[in-house]
Amino acid sequence: KSSNEATNITPKHNMKAFLDELKAENIKKFLYNFTQIPHLAGTEQNFQLAKQIQSQWKEFGLDSVELAHYDVLLSYPNKTHPNYISIINEDGNEIFNTSLFEPPPPGYENVSDIVPPFSAFSPQGMPEGDLVYVNYARTEDFFKLERDMKINCSGKIVIARYGKVFRGNKVKNAQLAGAKGVILYSDPADYFAPGVKSYPDGWNLPGGGVQRGNILNLNGAGDPLTPGYPANEYAYRRGIAEAVGLPSIPVHPIGYYDAQKLLEKMGGSAPPDSSWRGSLKVPYNVGPGFTGNFSTQKVKMHIHSTNEVTRIYNVIGTLRGAVEPDRYVILGGHRDSWVFGGIDPQSGAAVVHEIVRSFGTLKKEGWRPRRTILFASWDAEEFGLLGSTEWAEENSRLLQERGVAYINADSSIEGNYTLRVDCTPLMYSLVHNLTKELKSPDEGFEGKSLYESWTKKSPSPEFSGMPRISKLGSGNDFEVFFQRLGIASGRARYTKNWETNKFSGYPLYHSVYETYELVEKFYDPMFKYHLTVAQVRGGMVFELANSIVLPFDCRDYAVVLRKYADKIYSISMKHPQEMKTYSVSFDSLFSAVKNFTEIASKFSERLQDFDKSNPIVLRMMNDQLMFLERAFIDPLGLPDRPFYRHVIYAPSSHNKYAGESFPGIYDALFDIESKVDPSKAWGEVKRQIYVAAFTVQAAAETLSEVA
């Protein structure tokens, strides 16, 4: 059978039929259904939702839908011994206590099992001491404190504002600075957009709202007790002392009403500059400790959360491919939420549900995709990407041989301004071509393509007339597929206007106020942005699973490799004396990139010309495309981060959410002027250039003619 016969309808009609079947009203209905009660990982409610999704995906027409369970380390507050922070006087009396819960939103007053705000995986402890305000607790904030201001955080409790970087990096930095506790808070400067009311009257964070979240530094390990292997029934588990990525000091999050009470008394040093000031009516003094009248008062944390091995459930649905059933295109997003999950994750899960329904409708009409599509509803993403990582660890041999692409589907919206895409360069052309075929949902762009509105609102900084596409970082379920296994990956959602809204994420992120009503009233009443995201995510999956030649363009990798080589060379040249002294050469890297560019160009020419009716040659060329991303994987991983194995991209060592290019070289160069042994440090830079150059050259050779 030719591929078109096997799929039963002409490819163009298929895509149109698939997209036309997606309905905003269905997404709205699914979102409502998924957000009426909390679905915290490891709870009965989330297990019931997993079974409901399994049942509905079967009804929609998937070939099989299975639950995959694992027993992983999770973290919960103690129900009878709540977590809180106090100001204590010299007699040890608690003269102020932070709130024990968020005031529930209207209509949810009687909902049970709302987990109070906590920092997941915080150890237990009751440290007391002076407070130091550390801004965002970024690497550069601690450099400013320790090196410029000569402020020592050792033995202090630090208070940091949420935003800019992943909270786990903040905690790691505080630990390294010697802090004995961390208080995280949401400053209105970052979580309250001017001119917008707070929930329930708008989408801003009220003073009692608090961001939950895990504070792990897993570096891609998955379950902290079973790194590298699935947490199955016969797993060998590490002791808690050997667990991966757990914080060593107590951590707790608060809202800005409570933060005001702590920060208003701060004394010590003034803030170093305006970038350390938020929007509260407090001096933003750094400390340490409280000012004059309050100098005998201290801060005390009371943390009683427990870490527990708990069962989690992924839902895995399969739509078998007609021509290449052993080639997998995966669409996955998580199901577990901190509370109601109005945006994170259920705005994504509702979109996945509608995509499954549309594919199922086509299948019932006799159609099948060329390649197998796997659909996943991941559990325990909020606790460290655990469900996706354990499943990938269990199925790694299949995935590394058969995985074509992974499309992530967490929150569909974080705003309603324009599209945001992060993906492998292999998918740039796919995304461009697809968005040119889709209608823009944006006001003022009626009758225009999504590509046009996206390019206008979010232009590429390098290429005029093209939209910005960002590097993949981490903090979501694509991590194991891309950073560990080297499977081409991408993600898409609707976002805010980053130019005018400087706040981090969206204001109600991980709070009790992330409800269905938040989305329906304030973000997307017509669900038109959700529908557009469904079309982008679904359209990508459709093309990846159905196009005869994989829609990957290796020439786009060549372009970015050159850009990244230029960038890392420029960073290194900021140390010209050492470059000369230690004979640090980038020649091998530039040469490898040049070779990659030439070989990719020749491969693309062959791709245009080969006989697509020859199934062996077609499969050969497609395999070269599929395995190109895999070729960037170093089996030894990055230094001290064995599960980050991609040589071109890794999550930044300073912010898990951000992607870094040539991360091995970047980390070797970072703060190199402070290294005690410069010869050793520059030796590591040279080694990392060697690894990068070798990897790029080796990847290029996978695109050469096979014989």
Partner: nanobody, 113 residues
Framework: EVQLLESGGGLVQPGGSLRLSCAAS????????LSWVRQAPGKGLEWVSS????????DYAAFVKGRFTISRDNSKNTLYLQMNSLRVEDTAVYYC??????WGQGTLVTVSS
Amino acid sequence: EVQLLESGGGLVQPGGSLRLSCAASGFSFSSYALSWVRQAPGKGLEWVSSIGENNHTTDYAAFVKGRFTISRDNSKNTLYLQMNSLRVEDTAVYYCVKDGVHWGQGTLVTVSS
């Protein structure tokens, strides 16, 4: 054999301008990022600016930003540094650098009244 030949240095008054050139040969010019590095009398080497494969990808040291402009002409295998609003402290030997290990012999820029 890689060769980098700087020219365009000289004596100039404060506030004046100079344009340095670096003629390159012996390698595929357009395939490499390039840099300007300087060394003031009695001081260590100091990075000035770098450029990627085209004139969009540029990077400057804080002390020259807004005054100096790096550019390249791949058809002529030549790297440039346009230096405006020169200051006495810009006095140095300016080197053209390819890949970190291949350096030109340098051209002296003297800024003096």
